[in-house]
Structure formats: structure tokens, C-alpha cells
């Protein structure tokens, strides 16, 4: 129309899909009568009437926004209920009286799109690929307008480089309206991007501002070859024998490569392949001596068949050898001294001990132990340990037992044993000596013999309680060929008043086994023995 | 549209080669990757080997020294060989393609099934 | 390597049925998972991708949930021409199928 003025720039409402765009008509009072006021979609420059005022009353036209729109604010805002994307339009709305003006607004329509979905390559990427790799994928679900995708490498954003990154997206529309985002991160990858972290960013706006939402990050699996290979064993330090030993082999690609390990041979310095488990580690449970040398791992590439060998490592396992005493099995005479001697090989220092077996009292620190004018306590067993100390646990122990000559020596002179008539009872006698004694019983009953050791032997006598019986008691008697000696047992009647413990005899009905501690002796033989002492 | 169509034997003998053929229409092979899948039957799926849009290898562990995949560009195919077959191979094999923006499989032919026997 | 467990391996269920498939992974593998049916003779066609993302094409009553170790696919209310095998696909770390779900009618 000649002289009238161009239109000014629509007025921008802006509004979150599935929100209230208020669409307030601007025009004056000299413009127009806004209780009187028609307002139109403008779709692809074709007007579409869609609300009618008249008297400040609204009526909707039918058609796409009938349900949806509403006065407000005393007629002078329209009110667009559940925005979706195809609202974005320009809405005008016209006065009738005095003359026919319009005043135009711009919706713009926002939504947020989800989180992005990142995907990483499942396969992995090799380093030598030709040109650049599917690397990881991005999806940005229902937004609105589209929003830009910016690919990130440990927090830096990539760029498109030729050969080496290119950055692949595209966007479907959904049926809503909205916009799905797809993109693909293709990049020539390197070593070191093993542990790099990728994450794909999704920038949107809002009527708030800008905004942004980040994928979580991704490694990729970058496969590379191998360029080193090395053997590591488990445990670290010392090793001994009896330790479980991993010899693991290493190298530096990815996927590893197949592995084999070979030990040294001393004699033909020819290497011996070894058998290793299915992860390709060789484990030795448990370890021997043997089992030093000198290793080595190949590795193979099995596409190229081109093979890596690592630095030989040696392997010590530290060893104790059996112990040897001498002499064996030492036999002496009371008063007479003895000297015991040990003897062991180890791959380190060696340390020895001799300690009394019953006690464990170290007696000499040393491998040669002397022992002077030797009574007939200093029988029993002597253990030579022999121990490298900058191993702990590394040791091996020999037992040698001493035997001293006497006659039988009782564990108990006499002693009484309450009893009932009529009961079959169980007697037990203990003597020792060298040699080693045999036992007999004045009374008839069931007996058996047994060997606590080769100077000490136990007898057992089932025997039925009768009058005789409880008024002779019952001898057992001890001989070897150095002479006898006797322990008597006093059988008493058990009544009410004897079940009182008394300190000096063995109450109950209980076996009648003799104590080893309190020992008791005579002898028959004209040989003068010492004193007994209290063992143990 | 898109299409995947397998070809080879439907018979192999134990111990000899298997080569399968996969042409594919409607997507070029430098735009997506093909996977082979096998399923034997009354069985569940496998993946065997694939080749991405950038012409990388992929092989399945289990068979990798028997497999190799190749493909020509000029002609949409991708080819799966495989050596020293044995009676467990006997399965439908199938070639799938990778979709673009994504790690699974949008399109799959129909499938062939090789039977191995002597 | 990754093992893909289903439950059930089978199930009887009628016309109109809600169902549910499970899928265990035996890691994390995040969201990186598909659901594809077999029919008897054809090629296995996806259905989900991405745990929950719906294949184009597919009807509305499929629907795929979970992420990291356990997932589920359900059916809302089963079709005639829903009864078919069902397997799962991780795509985290390489590809593994699950043994697959024979759903029958009942």
C-alpha cells in the first residue's frame, strides 16, 4: 500500500513445548479496539483465522487450535495451551475500529532434549586403520529446535581434520515434532588414545538461555602391536621352596599377544618350552630348587607370525636340603658326654638351632650341640632346625633321640584306685628305659602292650574286681636286661564318704592310667640310681 | 530398499574351506559396517566377524585363525571364509548390517544354511 | 567375554497378555543393549535398541527397559503374531547374544 510504513519486526514469545504461550496484542488504543479483535496463524505466508473477539467475548474457529486457546487479561492476551513445535508460527492479531491495524508476534517454541546416549565402538579401533574409525555414537532424543553436537577428547573439543577426525550427524524428525539428533565420532586414533575419554555435548536453548547436557565418558578399546614383552614373577622378593610362584608374561600391546615361556636348560643350554595355564601364566606349586634358571617369554603376533623374545629373568628358589644329624640314633651311658653334629645344604646362609623336643627350650645356637655326664632325663628327643633368617618361614628340622642305658624307671611307684565289686576295671602301667623294658602283672587278666616310644612302653590290664583282689592289689612289674622294677596299685572300695577328693589319691571311677609326672622308683638291681626329678 | 542376500554351499565336507558370499543393496559398504552371525540349529545366535565402513577386520576369538572377511566395494559384497569346517559348524549363517549410528543390527539377510558332512 | 543370560527360556502366555523378558549381563554394559524377535525360518528382526529406544516400525507395545547389569523387555499386550523367539544382544564389549526366550502360545 503507497506510503505506509514497512512492517516492524514481529514481537518474540518465547515457550517450552507443552507450556502457555500468553500472545499479548500490542496495538494501542489508537489502533484499534481491542474488544473487537480478530486473531490469525500465519503458516507458510497463509493466513488462518483462529480467534474471534467481539464485546472482550472469545470464540474459537474450528480447526487445529479450537480446544487450545483462551482470553486472558481482560481480553488482551491469548492464551495458546499445550505447545508443541508446529506452533511455532507467527501469530497476528488484527483491530477492527477506526481503522484495521495488526500487530504481529513470533512464537518460538523450545524443548530440551534428553540426556545424550553415548555408544562407544564394541569392537575396538586399530591404530593403523586407513582412514578414520567409527569411534563412538551419540544420540540426542526429542529437542526442539535441533541442538549441536560438540565431540570431546580429555575435555578438549575436536574439530573436523582431514584424514584425521570427521564428525558425521544427522536428525530425524519424530512424529511429535521433535528433533532426534544422531552423531557419529570417526577419528584416526593413536597409542596413547588407549586411555583417552570421550564424551559427546548436546547445546540447546531455552527460553531461560543457552544450556547444554554432556554424555558420560567412554574409553575405546585401541588395539596396537606389541613392541615389548617382559616376564614378572609373583611373589616379589625371596622366593623358597614350597612358595606358589607365577611367572606371568607381559607385553605392551593390545590385544596381548600368545605367549610361551621356556626355561633354560643347564646341561644342553637349550631352552624348554613350560607348560603354562590358560591366561599364559606358568605356575610353579609348589616351588622347587629345580625350578631355578634362567626364563624367557616369546610372544607372537599370530597375524604377522612375527615373534618378540624378552630379557631373560633368572628365578632363584631358595632351599633348605634335609637335614642331616650325626650321629643317628646316639645311644650312651649315664655320665658319659655326647656330641651331636648337623648338617644341611641351602642356597643362602644357613642358621642352626638344637631345641629339647619336649620343651622346645633352645639348647644351642650352633650346629654342634654338647652334652655332659648325661642322666637319664637328657633321654628323649633333640631337634637340629636349620633356617636361612633373611627368609622367614625357610627352615627344615631333623629328630634324633637320644637314648640313655638304665634299667625300667616306673612313671608312678604306687597309687590308689577306687573301685567298685564286681566291675571288670582298666589298669594302665607306664615304664621306660633302655632297652626298652617289657611289663607282666601278678594277676591274671586281659593285657596289651604299646609303644609310646623306643625307650618307653605302656601296658593295659582289663581285670575283674574281686575279695581277693581288692585285698592283694595288683603289682606290674618292668625288666630289660639291665634290670626290673615294680608299681603297685592299692584297690580301695568306693562308699559315700571315700567320693571326697582327697589330695594324695586318685578318686573316681575312672581308668586307672598313670600320670607321666609324678615319678616314684626303686630297683631290685644292686645298680645305684639317681634320685628321680620331676620331667615336664 | 535395503537388502542383504547370503550365497555359497549348502554342503561342505569336514576339514575343508567354507566361503560365503553377502551382496548387499539399497547402503554402500563404505557407509556401514556387515557382520556375519551364525545360528546352529535349535540354537541361539553368534557373532561371528565383521568389517567396518572403514574397512577394519573383526573376528570372533573362538574361531580368529580360521576366519577371514574381506569385502569389494565395486560390487556391494563381503566375503566370509573359513577354514577346516567340522560337523559343529553346521549352522544358518547370516550377514548383517550395522546401523549407521549405531552398534546393532538394523538389516539382516535372510540366511543360508551350511550343513557340514562328510 | 561377556555372558548374556535370559529367563525365562520359555513361556506360555495367551492373547491380550502383559509379558516380561529378562536379560542379566554379567557386567555393567550401560545401556548398550538390543532386543530382537526370530520367527521360525527367518532372520531375527530388532525391536529395541539402546535398552529402551523403539526400532521404527515397531508397534508401541514392545517397550525395552534397565541399564547396567539387568534389563527387560515388555510386551503390553500380546498380538497373534508376537509368538516367536526372543533374544537379547549386548553391544558394550564385542557382541553376545542370550540364549534366547521361546515365547509360545498358551
Known amino acids: 500500500v503507497p506510503g505506509e510504513a514497512e512492517q516492524p519486526a514481529p514481537e518474540l514469545v518465547e515457550v517450552e513445548v507443552g507450556s502457555t504461550a500468553l500472545l499479548k496484542c500490542g496495538l494501542s488504543q489508537s489502533q484499534g479496539n481491542l474488544s473487537h479483535v480478530d486473531w490469525f496463524s500465519v503458516h507458510k505466508e497463509k493466513r488462518t483465522l483462529i480467534f474471534r473477539v467481539r464485546q472482550g467475548q472469545g470464540q474459537s474457529e474450528p480447526g487445529e487450535y479450537e480446544q487450545r486457546l483462551s482470553l486472558q487479561d481482560r481480553g488482551a492476551t491469548l492464551a495458546l495451551t499445550q505447545v508443541t513445535p508446529q506452533d511455532e508460527r507467527i501469530f497476528l492479531c488484527q483491530g477492527k475500529r477506526p481503522r484495521s491495524q495488526e500487530y504481529r508476534i513470533q512464537l518460538r517454541v523450545y524443548k530440551a532434549p534428553e540426556e545424550p546416549n553415548i555408544q562407544v565402538n564394541p569392537l575396538g579401533i586399530p591404530v593403523n586403520s586407513k582412514e578414520p574409525e567409527e569411534v563412538a555414537t551419540c544420540v540426542g532424543r526429542n529437542g526442539y529446535p535441533i541442538p549441536q553436537v560438540i565431540w570431546y577428547k580429555n575435555g578438549r573439543p575436536l574439530k573436523e581434520e582431514k584424514n584425521r577426525v570427521h564428525i558425521q550427524s544427522s536428525q530425524t524428525v519424530e512424529s511429535s515434532g521433535l528433533y532426534t539428533l544422531q552423531s557419529i565420532l570417526k577419528a584416526q586414533l593413536v597409542k596413547e588414545d588407549k586411555d583417552a575419554q570421550f564424551y559427546c555435548e548436546l547445546n540447546y536453548r531455552l527460553p531461560s538461555g543457552n544450556h547444554m547436557k554432556e554424555s558420560r565418558e567412554v574409553t575405546v578399546p585401541v588395539f596396537y602391536p606389541t613392541e615389548k614383552v617382559w616376564l614378572e614373577v609373583e611373589p616379589v622378593g625371596m622366593l623358597k621352596e614350597g612358595d606358589r610362584v607365577e611367572i606371568r608374561c607381559l607385553a605392551d600391546g593390545n590385544p596381548p599377544p600368545h605367549f610361551s615361556i621356556s626355561k633354560g636348560n643347564p646341561s644342553t643350554r637349550e631352552a624348554e618350552e613350560e607348560t603354562t595355564n590358560d591366561n599364559g601364566v606358568l605356575v610353579l606349586e609348589p616351588a622347587r630348587k629345580e625350578h631355578s634358571g634362567r626364563y624367557e617369554c616369546q610372544a607372537w603376533n599370530l597375524d604377522t607370525m612375527i615373534s618378540l623374545l624378552s630379557e631373560p629373568q633368572e628365578l632363584l628358589v631358595n632351599y633348605v636340603s634335609d637335614v642331616r644329624v650325626s650321629p643317628a640314633a646316639p645311644e650312651r651311658q649315664e655320665g658319659s658326654s655326647l656330641t651331636l653334629t648337623c648338617e644341611a645344604e641351602s642356597s643362602q646362609d644357613l642358621e642352626f638351632q638344637w631345641l629339647r623336643e619336649e620343651t622346645d627350650q633352645v639348647l644351642e645356637r650352633g650346629p654342634v650341640l654338647q652334652l655332659h655326664d648325661l642322666k637319664r632325663e637328657a633321654g628323649g628327643g633333640y631337634r637340629c632346625v636349620a633356617s636361612v633368617p633373611s627368609i622367614p618361614g625357610l627352615n627344615r628340622t631333623q629328630l634324633v633321640k637320644l637314648a640313655i642305658f638304665g634299667p625300667p624307671w616306673m612313671a608312678f611307684k604306687e597309687r590308689k584306685v577306687w573301685v567298685k565289686e564286681n566291675m571288670v576295671l582298666n589298669l594302665s602301667c607306664e615304664a621306660s628305659g633302655h632297652p626298652r623294658p617289657t611289663i607282666s602283672w601278678n594277676v591274671n587278666g586281659t593285657a596289651s602292650e604299646g609303644d609310646q616310644d623306643p625307650q618307653r612302653v605302656l601296658s593295659t590290664l582289663n581285670v575283674l574286681v574281686t575279695p581277693e583282689l581288692l585285698e592283694t592289689g595288683v603289682e606290674c612289674t618292668a625288666s630289660n636286661d639291665l634290670g626290673k622294677n615294680t608299681s603297685i596299685l592299692f584297690l580301695e572300695l568306693v562308699n559315700l564318704t571315700t567320693l571326697t577328693p582327697d589330695s594324695n589319691t586318685t578318686t573316681g571311677l575312672s581308668t586307672s592310667t598313670a600320670s607321666p609326672h609324678t615319678r616314684a622308683n626303686s630297683t631290685s638291681t644292686e645298680r645305684k640310681l639317681p634320685e628321680p626329678e620331676s620331667r615336664g | 530398499q535395503v537388502t542383504l542376500k547370503e550365497s555359497g554351499p549348502v554342503l561342505v565336507k569336514p576339514t575343508e574351506t567354507l566361503t560365503l558370499t553377502c551382496t548387499v543393496s539399497g547402503f554402500s559398504l563404505t557407509s556401514s559396517g556387515v557382520s556375519w552371525v551364525r545360528q546352529p540349529p535349535g540354537k541361539a545366535l553368534e557373532w561371528i566377524a565383521a568389517?567396518?565402513?572403514?574397512?577394519?577386520?573383526y573376528y570372533n576369538s573362538a574361531f580368529k585363525s580360521r576366519l577371514t572377511i574381506s569385502r569389494d566395494t565395486s560390487k556391494s559384497q563381503v566375503v566370509l571364509t573359513m577354514t577346516n569346517m567340522d560337523p559343529v559348524d553346521t549352522a544358518t549363517y547370516y550377514c548383517a548390517r550395522r546401523y549407521g549410528y549405531g552398534w546393532y543390527f538394523d538389516f539382516w539377510g535372510q540366511g543360508t544354511l551350511v550343513t557340514v558332512s562328510s | 567375554d561377556i555372558q548374556m543370560t535370559q529367563s525365562p527360556s520359555s513361556l506360555s502366555a495367551s492373547v491380550g497378555d502383559r509379558v516380561t523378558i529378562n536379560c542379566k549381563a554379567s557386567?555393567?554394559?550401560?545401556?548398550?543393549l538390543a532386543w530382537y524377535q526370530q520367527k521360525p525360518g527367518k532372520a531375527p528382526k530388532v525391536l529395541i535398541f539402546n535398552a529402551n529406544s523403539l526400532q521404527t516400525g515397531i508397534p508401541s507395545r514392545f517397550s525395552g527397559s534397565g541399564s547396567g547389569t539387568d534389563f527387560t523387555l515388555t510386551i503390553s499386550s500380546l498380538q497373534p503374531e508376537d509368538f516367536a523367539t526372543y533374544y537379547c544382544q549386548q553391544f558394550y564389549s564385542g557382541y553376545t547374544f542370550g540364549q534366547g526366550t521361546k515365547l509360545e502360545i498358551k
Open positions: 557386567q555393567n554394559i550401560y545401556n548398550s
Open positions: 568389517i567396518s565402513s572403514g574397512g577394519t577386520t
